[in-house]
């Protein structure tokens, strides 16, 4: 049977010393000192006599001589079963047993819930000797106790290599309900049931459960540990905590923010950082995210011309990195951009729209009706073309590159000239007699260059061979012209 | 030409709620926020919100979170601010205005007057 | 938020001469070279009418007279030379973040 002993219980002295199987509580100290989790063994040093095996909870003696009385098994005597006490109270137990003196050695060791206890604990073992036994009494002392002080504490001792194990003490801490589980902030759905969860724990047993938003308790009766409160929706962010009632009072849970996914506010700082002929790199800052993670944004681009007519060119994204290229753009236009989050309840608003410009783009339309001719008495060849029809997107003109390339028996080579934008004719030396000269132009703006007419050749023949007749592009979709002379 | 039509005049009691349209034409209407402001009599311009009707998401000046909510219908080109528990604070003339950098073109307002 | 804070509250401008409105910025709302920063003119009984745009652009059908500029957070509201038609109440606004503000408003006089 379990002695339980309760922290009002009174030792009762039978020899000097902390009495076997007493509970001693002292209440002097209540002061906290710091717990360890060891015990320094005692050793108990007495004639030399060999031992026997050991045989379980109990060491039998072997005789003493021939003939001689056996010896009473050594065991450990009883003590109180269970102490019962509140957190923070000092607590004193210990277990005792007499040795007969024929035994050296001895070492008594206390263990809690199979582990032994190691180190720095305050654990005090006396030596009370007598003719024939020694009365060996091990004390142990808990100063401030704490849950973690609960458990089944017991003595061993061990007698040349044989143990003997004490009954079980069972040390009970009682104090304010302690949390095992609390309510854990959520971002829910508007009008969306939820549960909440709270379990707390003694001893002492029962803990009930009250459940409080936002100051004001939520349940009439309480509900025993754990505890589910299903809430049937909100409209407007809460505040919920719980409280965990036993016998020594109560304890609150910290207060659990529940947050009502909304739609994210829209992003900021929409800022440019590249612009080209064609494409605008853009970054934000994501604005508040309404409780619930973004999803993708949405780029919405519009040009910004009184004649343009388009509609908003719409481009999807990931929601991270912060940063997209827009790209098809035409090159020298305004462009109004704005950027949009969403998340799971819906759409940011679009941020507030800025604008960017595209720079100046490269020709896209190559210079007309090139023609080209010998003028042999200068030694060179003459070349003529149209102004292209560029579009004001491209930028101004500045320039135009001539191509040629001079071809004759097993050379070829490429020469290319830079002209002004006021420019429509062109002179370029003979490189090779006896060869073909193939020419091509392309318009230049500060966008690039543009492409390149399609190619005329004209045939420069060796010294003496005269003719004027020009070399000239072909009307759109014939072949490439070659003159023959 | 860009127009914003707006209704006529409203008289509403304490508490209660009114919708007001403002109908465009003459655009792309999913292609332009639509912002409203308001103005007390005799006071400066207040900004209200914005609503982009291509995603309709929605934004609100703080002051009148709670007070006003933004819808627009796509079909018939027509944007709404609803403005509900009205007190004479409410009391004013609310525009509807094509949002891009600045507010080029204006419904020519709805006036509220809550009274008992 | 922004505050723009727009001076003078009332201005009286003989016909002809120059009338001078200003809207200072808490804060810049200029990015990526451009300032969203807009002027806006209301007659009594009419909605606002939109006469300048991103600080110093001239909006479609206003006269040339009417110019804006800008020098730091300041921003300027010129008209030169002005006329009878020009008195109204004229506002500043931005459009650089939410929410969008507006000045408090200039009520120009002709005399």
């Known amino acids: 049977a379990i002695t339980e002993a309760r922290e009002e219980a009174k030792p009762y002295p039978l020899f000097p010393g902390p009495l076997p199987g007493s509970l001693q509580t002292d209440h002097t100290s209540l002061l906290s000192l710091p717990h360890t989790s060891g015990y320094q063994p005692a050793l108990m040093f007495s004639p030399t006599q060999p031992g026997r095996p050991y045989t379980g909870n109990v060491a039998i003696p072997r005789v003493t001589s021939a003939g001689s009385k056996l010896l009473p098994p050594l065991a450990f005597k009883h003590t109180v079963g269970h102490i019962i006490l509140s957190e923070h109270k000092d607590v004193k137990f210990n277990c005792s047993i007499s040795v007969p003196n024929i035994y050296q050695d001895t070492t008594i060791s206390w263990w809690k819930d199979g582990k032994e206890l190691l180190g720095a604990h305050h654990a005090i073992t006396q030596f009370y000797p007598d003719d024939e036994v020694t009365a060996i009494i091990a004390s142990f002392s808990i100063t401030s106790v704490q849950r973690s002080d609960n458990g089944s504490y017991i003595c061993k001792m061990k007698i040349n290599n044989e143990e003997i194990v004490s009954d079980p003490i069972y040390i009970e801490v009682q104090g304010l309900p302690h949390f095992t589980k609390q309510p854990e902030s959520m971002n829910v759905t508007r009008n969306t049931a939820f549960n909440l969860t709270c379990q707390a724990v003694g001893p002492p047993e029962p803990v009930n459960i009250f459940w409080v938003q936002n100051s004001s308790r939520v349940n009439e009766q309480p509900e025993k540990s754990p505890s589910v409160l299903t809430v049937p929706g909100l409209t407007e962010m809460a505040v919920f905590s719980c409280e965990a009632h036993n016998d020594k009072g109560l304890t609150v849970s910290k207060g659990v923010q529940i947050n009502i996914k909304a739609i994210p506010s829209p992003p900021t700082e929409v800022s440019i950082h590249n612009s080209t002929a064609h494409s605008i790199l853009i970054s934000w800052v994501p604005g508040f995210d309404g409780y619930s993670p973004f999803r993708n944004c949405s780029v919405q681009v519009k040009e910004v011309d009184p004649l343009s007519n388009g509609s908003v060119m719409i481009f999807n994204t990931s929601a991270s990195p912060h940063m997209y290229q827009i790209k098809q753009l035409q090159a020298l236009a305004n462009y109004s951009i704005g950027v949009s989050c969403m998340n799971e309840i819906g759409w940011s608003a679009v941020s507030p729209w800025i604008l960017a410009s595209t720079t100046e783009g490269a020709p896209s339309v190559a210079p007309l009706n090139v023609t080209v001719f010998l003028n042999e008495s200068r030694d060179n060849v003459d070349i003529r073309w149209m102004k292209p029809l560029t579009k004001r997107q491209a930028g101004e003109l500045v320039g135009y590159r001539i191509s040629h390339v001079w071809q004759s028996a097993g050379i070829s080579k490429e020469l290319l000239e830079e002209v002004g934008q006021n420019n429509s004719r062109a002179q370029i030396s003979v490189q090779v007699h006896n060869a073909t000269c193939t020419v091509r132009i392309a318009a230049v703006t500060k966008g690039g260059v543009g492409p390149f007419s399609d190619p005329v050749k004209i045939f420069i023949p060796a010294h003496g061979w005269v003719d004027h007749a020009p070399s000239s592009t072909p009307a759109p979709g014939n072949a490439d012209p070659v003159l023959i002379i | 030409e860009v127009q914003l039509q707006q209704s006529g005049p409203e008289l509403v009691k304490p508490g209660a709620s009114v919708r007001i349209p403002c109908k465009a034409s003459g655009y792309t209407f999913s292609d332009y926020n639509m912002d409203w402001v308001k103005q007390s009599h005799g006071k400066s311009l207040e900004w209200i919100g914005n609503?982009?009707?291509?995603?309709?998401?929605?934004i609100y000046s703080q002051k009148f979170k709670g007070k006003a909510t933004l819808t627009v219908d796509k079909s018939s080109s027509t944007a709404y601010m609803e403005l509900r528990s009205l007190t004479s604070e409410d009391t004013a003339v609310y525009y509807c205005a094509r949002g891009d950098y600045g507010f080029a073109s204006w419904g020519q307002g709805t006036l509220v007057t809550v009274s008992a | 938020d922004i505050v723009l804070t727009q001076s003078p509250a009332s201005l009286t401008v003989s016909l002809g001469q120059r009338a001078t409105i200003s809207c200072r910025a808490s804060r810049s709302v200029s990015t990526s070279g451009y300032s969203y920063m807009h002027w806006y003119q209301q007659k009594p009984g009419q909605p606002p009418k939109l006469l300048i745009y991103l600080a110093s652009n001239l909006e479609s059908g206003v006269p040339a007279r009417f110019s804006g500029s800008r020098s730091g957070t300041d921003f300027t509201l010129n008209i030169h030379p002005v006329e009878e038609e020009d008195a109204a109440t004229y506002y500043c606004?931005?459009?650089?973040?939410?929410?969008?503000?507006f000045g408090s408003g200039t009520k120009l006089e002709i005399k």
């Open positions: 609503i982009n009707p291509n995603i309709g998401g929605t």
């Open positions: 606004q931005h459009s650089r973040e939410y929410p969008f503000t």
